[in-house]
């Protein structure tokens, strides 16, 4: 068992690292160093996770996992997937709320809340993509609806009604003085 | 209570020989490595020797390689040093020592009570 | 061989001072260091393994630091139980290595 500094390992398989006095073989996901092996090429003592921890991969040098992270109830959060031994838990967004993220440049591990999908049916639209990552992206109007201003204005029933020139066109009305 | 107790000290002629003995209790021995460590009268420490815990691996320091043998009984709970061609400088307390409790292998977090060997 | 040099050999102190022991190693040893406390006509004891790591029992009084060939154990607030020889030891490879250890006596 030569020098100190990073020596090879002439151990069988290539999982196999100095730490400290021997050459041992690491630990597997989900589980933490307790202590070194004892011997040249010999297993290090690896405990299990306790709950509510993890490790996501093979280590020579844990001696904790870490802790799981707990999805944000404030911002809205769901756990999508359980913490497990491997892996820590997914947090995202129920049914119905999307992922808003709270940097501009975002990745996996930004921080974000869930926000309520925007309903295009309240609003009389078709829903031209459904909301997932982002919000719902929401069309024209519904048949018997017509594009007044910001939103959708029902069809007059009656002819005794206004009917604008963008009505009359949807709406099959003509204009009424 | 976690103890070592060591024996077979005593007076020897240059040499000669001696066999210490380590007796463990308190802790499963089988699973733990040791290794005996010495301390002449007035000095520091010196490491001697290291065994594994299924005896697969040992090492010597290079003052006593070849003349000292370390070795266990795993069914007695016992640590040995076999000792020949004692010296003067070989003279000193004799202690087994052990880890039980410590993530760091090669420390030493039990010591026994030690056991005097004079070469003379 | 890895050989440790611990500074100073001996130091007079009083009760509630803060002592600093200092170790070095020859080579790199990463944190394979521990720290064993000893008095006359006893065993040594363990207190610190893995450079900064305290063993359970032992006081908070001491405390270890260090990375790569520099280490330092510090005893804060000196107790009359503290009087002793201290002694560091590398565990980065065989063979295992001792400092000439530090005597703390009473100023």
């Known amino acids: 068992q030569g020098g100190t500094r990073s020596p090879r390992c002439d151990c069988a398989g290539d999982f196999h690292k100095k730490i400290g006095l021997f050459c041992c073989r690491g630990c597997p996901a989900g589980h933490y160093l307790k202590a070194p092996c004892t011997e040249p090429c010999g297993n290090s003592t690896c405990l299990v996770c306790p709950q509510d921890t993890f490790l996501a991969w093979e280590n020579h040098h844990n001696s904790e996992c870490a802790r799981c992270q707990a999805c944000d109830e404030q911002a809205s959060q769901v756990a999508l997937e359980n913490c497990s031994a491997v892996a820590d838990t997914r947090c995202g967004c129920k049914p119905g709320w999307f992922v808003e993220c709270q940097v501009s440049q975002c990745v996996s591990s930004s921080p974000f809340y869930c926000q309520p999908c925007l309903d295009c049916g309240a609003l009389h639209r078709h829903t031209r993509l459904l909301c997932s990552r982002r919000d719902t992206d929401c069309g024209t109007c519904l048949p018997g609806f017509y594009e007044h201003g910001d939103g959708c204005v029902s069809c007059p029933t009656s002819t005794l009604g206004s009917c604008p020139e963008r009505c009359a066109a949807v709406c099959g009305w003509r204009q009424m003085f | 209570e976690v103890q070592l107790v060591e024996s077979g000290g005593g007076l020897v002629k240059p040499g000669g020989s001696l066999r210490l003995s380590c007796a463990a209790s308190?802790?499963?021995?089988?699973?733990?490595?040791m290794s005996w460590i010495r301390q002449a009268p007035g000095k520091g420490l010196e490491w001697v020797s290291y065994?594994?815990?299924?005896?697969?691996?040992?090492n010597y320091a290079d003052s006593v390689k070849g003349r000292f043998t370390i070795s266990r009984d795993n069914a007695k709970n016992s640590l040995y040093l076999q000792m020949n061609s004692l010296r003067a400088e070989d003279t000193a307390v004799y202690y087994c020592?052990?880890?039980?409790?410590?993530?760091?292998?090669?420390?030493?977090?039990?010591w026994g009570q030690g056991t005097l060997v004079t070469v003379s | 061989d890895i050989e440790m040099t611990q500074s100073p050999s001996s130091v007079s102190a009083s009760v509630g001072d803060t002592v600093t022991i200092t170790c070095r190693a020859s080579q790199h040893i990463s944190n394979w260091l521990a720290w064993y406390q000893q008095k006359p006509g006893q065993a040594p004891k363990f207190l610190i393994y893995?450079?900064?790591n305290l063993q359970s029992g032992v006081p908070s009084r001491f405390s270890g630091s260090g990375y790569g060939t520099d280490f330092t154990l510090t005893i804060s607030g000196l107790q009359p139980e503290d009087f002793a020889t201290y002694y560091c030891?590398?565990?980065?490879?065989?063979?295992?290595?001792f400092g000439g250890g530090t005597k703390v006596d009473i100023k």
């Open positions: 893995t450079a900064s």
């Open positions: 030891q590398q565990a980065d490879s065989f063979p295992l290595t």
């Open positions: 308190g802790f499963t021995f089988s699973d733990y490595y």
């Open positions: 065994i594994s815990s299924s005896s697969s691996y040992t």
């Open positions: 020592a052990s880890n039980v409790d410590t993530a760091m292998v090669g420390a030493f977090d039990i």
